[in-house]
Amino acid sequence: VPPGEDSKDVAAPHRQPLTSSERIDKQIRYILDGISALRKETCNKSNMCESSKEALAENNLNLPKMAEKDGCFQSGFNEETCLVKIITGLLEFEVYLEYLQNRFESSEEQARAVQMSTKVLIQFLQKKAKNLDAITTPDPTTNASLLTKLQAQNQWLQDMTTHLILRSFKEFLQSSLRALRQM
């Protein structure tokens, strides 16, 4: 132990410690609960949750979605391909979660918690996928201009964007949860 430091070990008790899979599962459910809290405010504030004009706004967004080729569905399940897709998708969602940060009045803290807990989830998954090189990180410049574009939208589109981000993120996490439980 270096000088000026003191080290104390913590030993595990007889109870089973959390495994990587259990902790990732809990982290996703934590984020999903956070999304539910944010959606509650969004739906109370506007009628976006019942709107039929979603397709209009959805064209402007390139939100990550699970597809057959990603190997995350039961038919054609592929652990490696799927894990890459989950991590890549979460990294792509980060810019949208950044956009959400100024979109909530009474749930500002929850929006921050969703953003931070997603960063933690990415770290947990990257540890699990340490041998995978196929993970591409989004370009910061592209993200910055996307953020500017989203923030420049009119109020109605901003409300719709917020609603769509939360809904898509929820669907993506639910698909990820199902897939990870098969790994």
């Epitope: 913590v10 959390l18 990587s20 902790r23 934590y30 984020i31 807990s117 960063k119 933690v120």
Partner: nanobody, 124 residues
Framework: GGGLVQPGGSLRLSCAAS????????IGWFRQAPGKEREGVSC????????YYADSVKGRFTISRDSAKNTVYLQMNSLKPEDTGVYYC????????????????????????RGQGTQVTVSS
């Protein structure tokens, strides 16, 4: 055990875990001064990395983690004689429910694992 430090000095406590991954747990640092009740000094959530500091240590103490070393730290600066006591770290699942209250981390009943403690004495 810990160490004897002069007032105004610094000390870094480290807490390494064996048999489980510290990253998966909320972390707490506690201390017990002679003849006083155990006090929660600082905590860090594993879910969203939120931190908590007792008023008495705010601005002087910093909690951190090192995933690669499976270790957590408490950096203590500008130490005062009233910081004297036995310090120990703990790990628990108090932070796994969305909307948890960070201040609950100071309850030692919230923890599954606990270090054996180290004596810190601040005196000239």
């Amino acid at each position: 055990g810990g160490g004897l430090v002069q007032p105004g000095g610094s000390l870094r406590l480290s807490c390494a875990a064996s048999g489980f991954t510290l990253d998966y747990y909320g972390i707490g640092w506690f201390r017990q001064a002679p003849g006083k009740e155990r006090e929660g000094v600082s905590c860090m959530s594993s879910s969203d990395l939120k931190t908590y500091y007792a008023d008495s240590v705010k601005g002087r103490f910093t909690i951190s983690r090192d995933s690669a070393k499976n270790t957590v730290y408490l950096q203590m600066n500008s130490l005062k004689p009233e910081d004297t006591g036995v310090y120990y770290c703990a790990a628990g699942t108090w932070d796994l429910k969305f909307g948890y209250n960070i201040t609950t981390c100071v309850r030692s009943s919230e923890y599954d694992y606990r270090g054996q403690g180290t004596q810190v004495t601040v005196s000239s």
